[in-house]
């Protein structure tokens, strides 16, 4: 199972639920579905209030039981380490795959943290991060922001991923904007 890591804004916008959590238990396999379940302790919710309701507490995250079908394998044994988890809701349960955005909170730049906390949501409705995988590539719409990180380096470590968000400049136009300048 292979997939290109998305821009964090894309991960935020395409997910039903975005939370900060610690992985606290040994994974278990559900025999009825052959999904594995990780026990988590949620510390913050950034997206999904309406889907879940304000009082909701996510205690488990679900993923396919095998790597070949995009199951997520959590490699860290540090149970106090916080992770940003962006996933999908299926029957009220949080599901992730290898292709989901799951990253140690401490590995995120201050700009990315700001994005998940506050800013990415502003761009979800109108704007689209458009991956440029090979040259030449051109914008197909004024609401697209051309994401070129993959051309230069690993997509998660690129400047646009770590410091920029695709946000509305005016109706029908989105541009890359610095998240740094928005950090109070």
């Amino acid at each position: 199972c292979t997939c290109v890591p998305p821009h964090p804004q894309t991960a935020f916008c395409n997910s039903d639920l975005v939370i900060r959590a610690k992985f606290v238990g040994t994974p278990e396999v559900n025999q009825t579905t052959l999904y594995q379940r990780y026990e988590i302790k949620m510390t913050k919710m950034y997206k999904g209030f309406q889907a879940l309701g304000d009082a909701a507490d996510i205690r488990f995250v679900y993923t396919p039981a095998m790597e070949s079908v995009c199951g997520y394998f959590h490699r860290s044994h540090n149970r106090s380490e916080e992770f940003l988890i962006a996933g999908k809701l299926q029957d009220g349960l949080l599901h992730i795959t290898t292709c989901s955005f799951v990253a140690p909170w401490n590995s995120l730049s201050l700009a990315q943290r700001r994005g998940f906390t506050k800013t990415y949501t502003v761009g979800c409705e109108e704007c689209t991060v458009f991956p440029c995988l090979s040259i030449p590539c051109k914008l197909q719409s004024g609401t697209h922001c051309l994401w070129t990180d993959q051309l230069l380096q690993g997509s998660e470590k690129g400047f646009q991923s770590r410091h920029l968000a695709c946000l509305p400049r005016e109706p029908g136009l989105c541009t890359w904007q610095s998240l740094r300048s928005q950090i109070a």
């Epitope: 040994t26 994974p27 396999v29 025999q31 009825t32 579905t33 052959l34 999904y35 594995q36 396919p64 039981a65 095998m66 790597e67 070949s68 079908v69 199951g71 394998f73 490699r75």
Partner: antibody, heavy 113, light 111 residues
Framework: QVQLVESGGGLVQPGGSLRLSCAAS????????MSWVRQAPGKGLEWVSV????????YYADSVKGRFTISRDNSKNTLYLQMNSLRAEDTAVYYC??????WGQGTLVTVSS | DIALTQPASVSGSPGQSITISCTGT?????????VSWYQQHPGKAPKLMIY???NRPSGVSNRFSGSKSGNTASLTISGLQAEDEADYYC??????????FGGGTKLTVLG
């Protein structure tokens, strides 16, 4: 008590097909993932395939992928393994097993011309 | 292709204790609490002796015990008896290959 009974083994020519069955009793069949595991003569154990309790997910070992199909009929408490394009190296005792615990007595499959 | 490493053979005298190791990786033995041990006498089906690392099914003697440390699981048989002579296989759930086995260990009871 929990019991698994395999059937359907036998002698088959290379390239041929065979369907194994496993009748389960003594437990809530649809709550458990079920596997097929095989053991070639004088060799160790090799996992072949697994199916989820509800039948929606199936996984296969690389050695049988595309040739074998696992299925189940929860109304009959029965597990199946359809084996096509059989090869000499598929010769083994095939065991039906509940996920990570109870096994049947096995059925011998011999692939030879 | 054997995924879990077991010693090919171990031996002990009646009454002694022996331990069989089973070494894997963080994606199998080390990552989950799903390690089982089976006893297989010649010509017979494997019999479950330990499941979920250290649990004994009903009917299995308390002389058999299981444990795990890191990526290595162990089966200990105390008060060795003649009928314990058999092949022993470890098995683990594995994230990459779903289910993996050790190559088997032949236990010989001396005397």
């Amino acid at each position: 008590q929990v019991q698994l009974v395999e059937s359907g083994g036998g002698l088959v020519q290379p390239g041929g097909s065979l369907r194994l069955s496993c009748a389960a009793s003594g437990f809530t069949f649809n709550s458990y993932a079920m596997s097929w595991v095989r053991q070639a003569p004088g060799k160790g154990l090799e996992w072949v395939s697994v199916i989820s309790g509800n039948g929606s997910n199936t996984y296969y070992a690389d050695s049988v992928k595309g040739r074998f199909t696992i299925s189940r009929d929860n109304s009959k408490n029965t597990l199946y393994l359809q084996m096509n394009s059989l090869r000499a190296e598929d010769t083994a005792v095939y065991y039906c097993a509940r996920f990570l615990d109870i096994w049947g007595q096995g059925t011998l499959v011999t692939v030879s011309s | 292709d054997i995924a879990l490493t077991q010693p090919a053979s171990v031996s002990g005298s009646p009454g002694q204790s022996i331990t069989i190791s089973c070494t894997g990786t963080s994606s199998d033995v080390g990552g989950y609490n799903y390690v089982s041990w089976y006893q297989q006498h010649p010509g017979k089906a494997p019999k479950l002796m330990i499941y979920d690392v250290s649990n004994r099914p009903s009917g299995v003697s308390n002389r058999f015990s299981g444990s795990k440390s890191g990526n290595t699981a162990s089966l200990t048989i105390s008060g060795l008896q003649a009928e314990d002579e058999a092949d022993y296989y470890c098995q683990s759930y594995d994230f990459v290959r779903f289910m993996v086995f050790g190559g088997g260990t032949k236990l010989t009871v001396l005397g």
